[in-house]
């Protein structure tokens, strides 16, 4: 419905605090360099103008729309140009023109630096001192580095932020109190960064109908006993709030997330019966809960798929009247019934359904051209299942750090030229699939391991997209969503690649390394895998373990040493001798 | 735009083969089926078959089995029709044409004669 | 197979005249298509999937039926109508034509 102030209906709709917070959620994503204090500063006076608005909606400007507001707000910044480089040809466009430009110089890898944790005394004498200080900093850090992230869960994530720190700041051992839930919310919204990072991918590279077909097949899943026009309208209104925050939309997309919510929770009868705990808590929480909530109970006695989709005289007749709502609700009814699929291969299923229409309900006898249109899926779902089962008795063979490295040999040949960072950040989070997944019994390993195996491909295709490099990692990650996973699987050695000069630097080492925790430690030992693979795609996983487990002894051995420095110069020297004669460099 | 374009008019001797061709362009040529129609003088039109250039299936009117053989090269998108054995009964005209869902053809070559002569 | 009956066979009408044609199946068919055709010219598809015009087909022109019965009008006879028009079904292996249906201006 109409409204004469957008801006004054969101603030009215959201209440002071959260159009606040999402306000600098927005301008920190779009203008991630910016310092904290510049961005306090225009959402004050953001917020103050949206005042005026509530209490006359006529006043000069309110009319205007939010991107108008907000992109005129950020087109102000002083020193766009020297910071931000082209981005500012931006504010010479009109709307839509300008939020589309703003979207397009988001940066997924900004060049900042690492957030680096105080002590716990000075940070719970900061959020003391100036609590609403402390927690739009928060804010302002996880959105600047995170320009995708869901705004109104890192609503929620800041919520739980704050309530750590008022309940550990007064315990008796802040730190033992602290420092876990902060290790949680980091590697739970690293998680949540990635998974909507993904869900941004599908609308913005392969379109609206790709996410609600993503909707479609994971809301069935999780609402088996909802009829297809229920799970329809959620996927309609999910579309609309993940369209608007990926659009930078974030009021209106916090607003309809909510709405959302309350509707889940006045019909979760046609719904879920799982809904009932969510439904209690509070907005931030409910929605969290929602979106996380397990899987109902499949309906009992379900008819065979056959019957509507491959026995009915009527399927081209129905497939031709209205393509996409019959093949929505192919894909509600295989993927209601399997729980144990991911949405991946669900959406490949419907895939191949849809093409064997195409060509069948073209054909001189479509009937037998179709018939048996459910045997080409038996290959798709073996190899998905076939390829977890191998890689989760890897991971039990070899533990996380070893496997972590295994899958980084993998992709470093595949792959070579992708930069070493990316590399050891991506075959690292691939890695992290087997304590993540390999746990659960069979029936949900596979939507647990290749939906996650989706987020972390995606993570890999956003940073290539910004530097391409490799015409293989574009290929994979543009033909087609879905079969991303299966076409970095299928990539063997790229026999193309000239192998890297070797670099004695590279594989220099200091004492600094002792210092750091384990996973810094792994981390370094492990770009220098990368690099060596690098410098000699050919070797052996012998020779490769060979070696590492001689760099493993080596940082041992001189992390003990009375002349920790001397040590690594010294020692240092003979290993990559030692190292070059092993794999022939 | 799509387009069919067929190969020039053929006079040959009966009881030997003709292999008749038709260039697609315009268009995924491997996602429809090529049909075959054939179109006497004065008379009617009659299906021949058809061809899924992307994975070579083929459905025949069981009149023109063993008479024609349907073959597709996705490289130069081309569908072909061989027909053999000839007598004077296959002289006609034989047009391509693209099926589309529920099996209309949408567009068609513009028809290659062929005349069985001794 | 599906045999299909046209008729009549052949037909004349005057410009502003309502035409009507008919095309009946030997069993019932899934969708009836109409082609038109112009003598030396290959045909054109008229109208497709029972009831729709193809692209560039004069509003005048509309197609009907179910079953075994099915037709095609003709609002108001313009003289460019003068053709051949054949339906042609699907839903039955092989696909099949009518003989074909003659219309002449008169």
């Known amino acids: 419905d109409a409204h004469k102030s957008e801006v004054a209906h969101r603030f009215k709709d959201l209440g002071e605090e959260n159009f606040k917070a999402l306000v600098l959620i927005a301008f920190a994503q779009y203008l991630q360099q910016c310092p904290f204090e510049d961005h306090v500063k225009l959402v004050n006076e953001v917020t103050e103008f949206a005042k005026t608005c509530v209490a006359d909606e006529s006043a000069e400007n309110c009319d205007k729309s939010l991107h108008t507001l907000f992109g005129d707000k950020l087109c102000t910044v002083a020193t766009l140009r020297e910071t931000y480089g082209e981005m500012a040809d931006c504010c010479a466009k009109q709307e839509p023109e300008r939020n589309e430009c703003f979207l397009q110089h988001k940066d997924d890898n900004p060049n900042l630096p690492r957030l680096v944790r105080p002590e716990v005394d000075v940070m719970c004498t900061a959020f003391h001192d100036n609590e609403e200080t402390f927690l739009k900093k928060y804010l302002y850090e996880i959105a600047r580095r995170h320009p995708y992230f869901y705004a109104p869960e890192l609503l929620f994530f800041a919520k739980r932020y704050k309530a750590a720190f008022t309940e550990c700041c007064q315990a008796a051992d802040k730190a033992a109190c602290l420092l876990p839930k902060l290790d949680e919310l980091r590697d739970e919204g690293k998680a949540s960064s990635a998974k909507q990072r993904l869900k941004c991918a599908s609308l913005q590279k392969f379109g609206e109908r790709a996410f609600k077909a993503w909707a479609v097949a994971r809301l069935s899943q999780r609402f088996p006993k909802a009829e297809f026009a229920e799970v329809s309208k959620l996927v309609t209104d999910l579309t609309k709030v993940h369209t608007e925050c990926c659009h930078g939309d974030l009021l209106e997309c916090a607003d309809d997330r909510a709405d959302l919510a309350k509707y889940i929770c006045e019909n979760q009868d046609s719904i879920s019966s799982k809904l009932k705990e969510c439904c209690e808590k509070p907005l931030l929480e409910k929605s969290h809960c929602i979106a996380e909530v397990e899987n109902d109970e499949m309906p009992a006695d379900l008819p065979s798929l056959a019957a509507d989709f491959v026995e009915s005289k009527d399927v081209c007749k129905n497939y031709a009247e209205a393509k996409d709502v019959f093949l929505g609700m192919f894909l509600y009814e295989y993927a209601r019934r399997h729980p144990d699929y991911s949405v991946v291969l669900l959406l490949r299923l419907a895939k191949t359904y849809e093409t064997t229409l195409e060509k069948c309900c073209a054909a001189a006898d479509p009937h037998e051209c179709y018939a048996k249109v459910f045997d080409e899926f038996k290959p798709l779902v073996e190899e998905p299942q076939n390829l977890i089962k191998q890689n989760c008795e890897l991971f039990e063979q070899l533990g996380e750090y070893k496997f972590q490295n295994a899958l980084l040999v993998r992709y470093t040949k595949k792959v070579p030229q992708v930069s070493t960072p990316t590399l050891v950040e991506v075959s690292r989070n691939l890695g992290k699939v087997g304590s993540k997944c390999c746990k659960h019994p069979e029936a949900k390993r596979m939507p647990c391991a290749e939906d996650y195996l989706s987020v972390v491909l995606n993570q890999l295709c956003v940073l290539h997209e910004k530097t391409p490099v490799s015409d293989r990692v574009t290929k994979c990650c543009t033909e087609s969503l879905v079969n991303r996973r299966p076409c970095f699987s299928a990539l063997e050695v790229d026999e193309t690649y000239v192998p890297k000069e070797f670099n004695a630097e590279t594989f220099t080492f200091h004492a600094d390394i002792c210092t750091l925790s384990e996973k810094e430690r792994q981390i370094k030992k492990q770009t220098a895998l990368v690099e060596l693979v690098k410098h000699k795609p050919k070797a052996t996983k012998e020779q490769l373990k060979a070696v590492m487990d001689d760099f493993a002894a080596f940082v041992e051995k001189c992390c003990k040493a009375d002349d920790k420095e001397t040590c690594f110069a010294e020692e240092g020297k003979k290993l990559v001798a030692a190292s070059q004669a092993a794999l022939g460099l | 735009q799509v387009q069919l374009q067929q190969s020039g008019a053929e006079l040959v001797r009966p009881g030997s083969s003709v292999k008749i061709s038709c260039k697609a362009s315009g268009y995924a040529f491997s996602n429809y089926w090529m049909n075959w129609v054939k179109q006497r003088p004065g008379q009617g039109l009659e299906w021949i078959g058809q061809?899924?250039?992307?994975?070579?299936?083929?459905y025949y009117n069981g009149r023109f089995k063993g008479k024609a053989t349907l073959t597709a090269d996705k490289s130069p998108t081309t569908a072909y029709m061989q027909l053999s054995s000839l007598t004077s009964e296959d002289s006609a005209v034989y047009v391509c044409?693209?099926?589309?869902?529920?099996?209309?053809?949408?567009?068609w070559g513009q028809g290659t004669t062929l005349t069985v002569s001794s | 197979q599906i045999v299909l009956t046209q008729s009549p066979a052949i037909m004349s009408a005057s410009p502003g005249e309502k035409v009507t044609m008919t095309c009946s199946a030997s069993?019932?068919?899934?969708?009836m298509h109409w082609y038109q055709q112009k003598s030396g010219t290959s045909p054109k598809r008229w109208i497709y999937d029972t009831s729709k015009l193809a692209s560039g087909v004069p509003v005048r022109f509309s197609g009907s039926g179910s079953g075994t019965s099915y037709s095609l009008t003709i609002r108001s006879m313009e003289a460019e109508d003068a053709a051949t028009y054949y339906c042609?079904?699907?839903?039955?292996?092989?696909?099949?034509f009518g003989a074909g249906t003659k219309l002449e201006l008169k």
């Open positions: 069993s019932s068919v899934s969708y």
């Open positions: 044409a693209r099926g589309v869902l529920l099996g209309s053809f949408d567009y």
């Open positions: 042609q079904q699907w839903g039955s292996n092989p696909l099949t």
């Open positions: 061809i899924y250039p992307g994975d070579g299936d083929t």
